[in-house]
């Protein structure tokens, strides 16, 4: 599940938010490492209300959430974390 998502596209996020999103509102998270056309790490969150937001990777709440998800990565994740590798 925790592969790396590489892309040759430029940055996806035109603005980022630090506003906390409760986990129960989150449907999916995608992490895009820096490089390959974008100089910064990007975190994209799909919410259950059919909205999508870029989260500031420096936001404490998302760092905590990602740490929890990494620790649980051996079991079923309540929030899917997508880091698929694109050839």
């Amino acid at each position: 599940v925790l592969e790396v998502y590489y892309t040759s596209l430029r940055c996806r996020c035109v603005q980022e938010s630090s506003v906390f999103i409760p986990r129960r509102f989150i449907d999916r998270i995608q992490i895009l490492p820096r490089g390959n056309g974008c100089p910064r790490k990007e975190i994209i969150v799909w919410k259950k209300n059919k909205s999508i937001v870029c989260v500031d990777p420096q936001a404490e709440w998302i760092q905590r959430m990602m740490e929890v998800l990494r620790k649980r990565s051996s079991s079923t994740l309540p929030v899917p974390v997508f880091k698929r590798k694109i050839p």
Partner: antibody, heavy 122, light 107 residues
Framework: QVTLKESGPGILQPSQTLSLTCTFS??????????VGWIRQPSGKGLEWLAN???????YSNPSLQSRLTISKDTSNNQAFLTITNVDTADTATYYC??????????????WGQGVRVTVSS | DIQMTQSPSSMSASLGDRVTITCQAS??????LIWFQQKPGRSPRPMIY???NLANGVPSRFSGSRSGSDYSLTISSLESEDMADYHC?????????FGSGTKLEIK
């Protein structure tokens, strides 16, 4: 190449039910993040958002029409549908369907159909 | 619901003029705004997304800006092909709402 095309009755009478079909290609409503919306435009006036339906059958509609409006889809035939019951002359408009894809950057209604003109007249 | 107040409703300008159209949001929409151009007899197409970003294929004479709750579309030097209706859309929350539209004509 993404295309959408609306079809409908053209003309109908007050109190009847309007049924519209959006037939699309170039994307699938089974794909995560895909949605189709309906928007209408009375002649010479502005746009009004009516409803969205998403890949997982989640639906959102305009509260001003919610009691009369139903949105649905047929993924196997790449179609989305809109019905409005008990129509009135105020429902006379060009009706558009448009695609939305939940990707970043998110641009709702990035592709539109050509529109279908609907006239409600007695 | 979020109201989008668009002005002017119509305007006439000369070729080469700088033209600005504004939408004011009744609540904070945090740049969740798109500008659509609709040429006569055609469907709308997105020109500006997230308030300030140019969509693919849009000429650089178009730009978007924000000042508080006011969102503006500016054409730096009007060309004849810019004659169209322009609509703003907020997509911060449902129900999505459009401005009332601006008809831009060439003098």
């Amino acid at each position: 190449q993404v295309t959408l095309k609306e079809s409908g009755p053209g003309i109908l009478q007050p109190s009847q039910t309007l049924s519209l079909t959006c037939t699309f290609s170039g994307f699938s409503l089974t794909t995560y993040g895909m949605g189709v919306g309906w928007i209408r435009q009375p002649s010479g006036k502005g746009l009004e958002w009516l409803a969205n339906i998403w890949w997982d059958d989640d639906k959102y509609s305009n509260p001003s029409l919610q009691s009369r409006l139903t949105i649905s889809k047929d993924t196997s035939n790449n179609q989305a549908f809109l019905t409005i019951t008990n129509v009135d002359t105020a429902d006379t408009a060009t009706y558009y369907c448009a695609r939305s894809e939940l990707v970043m950057p998110y641009v709702p209604f990035d592709y539109w159909g050509q529109g279908v003109r609907v006239t409600v007249s007695s | 619901d979020i109201q989008m107040t668009q002005s002017p409703s119509s305007m006439s300008a000369s070729l080469g003029d700088r033209v600005t159209i504004t939408c004011q949001a009744s609540q904070d929409i945090d740049n969740h705004l798109i500008w659509f151009q609709q040429k006569p007899g055609r469907s709308p197409r997105p020109m500006i997304y997230y308030a300030t970003n140019l969509a693919n294929g849009v000429p650089s004479r178009f730009s978007g800006s924000r000042s508080g709750s006011d969102y503006s579309l500016t054409i730096s030097s009007l060309e004849s092909e810019d004659m169209a209706d322009y609509h703003c859309l907020q997509f911060k929350q449902y129900p999505f709402t459009f401005g009332s539209g601006t008809k831009l004509e060439i003098k």
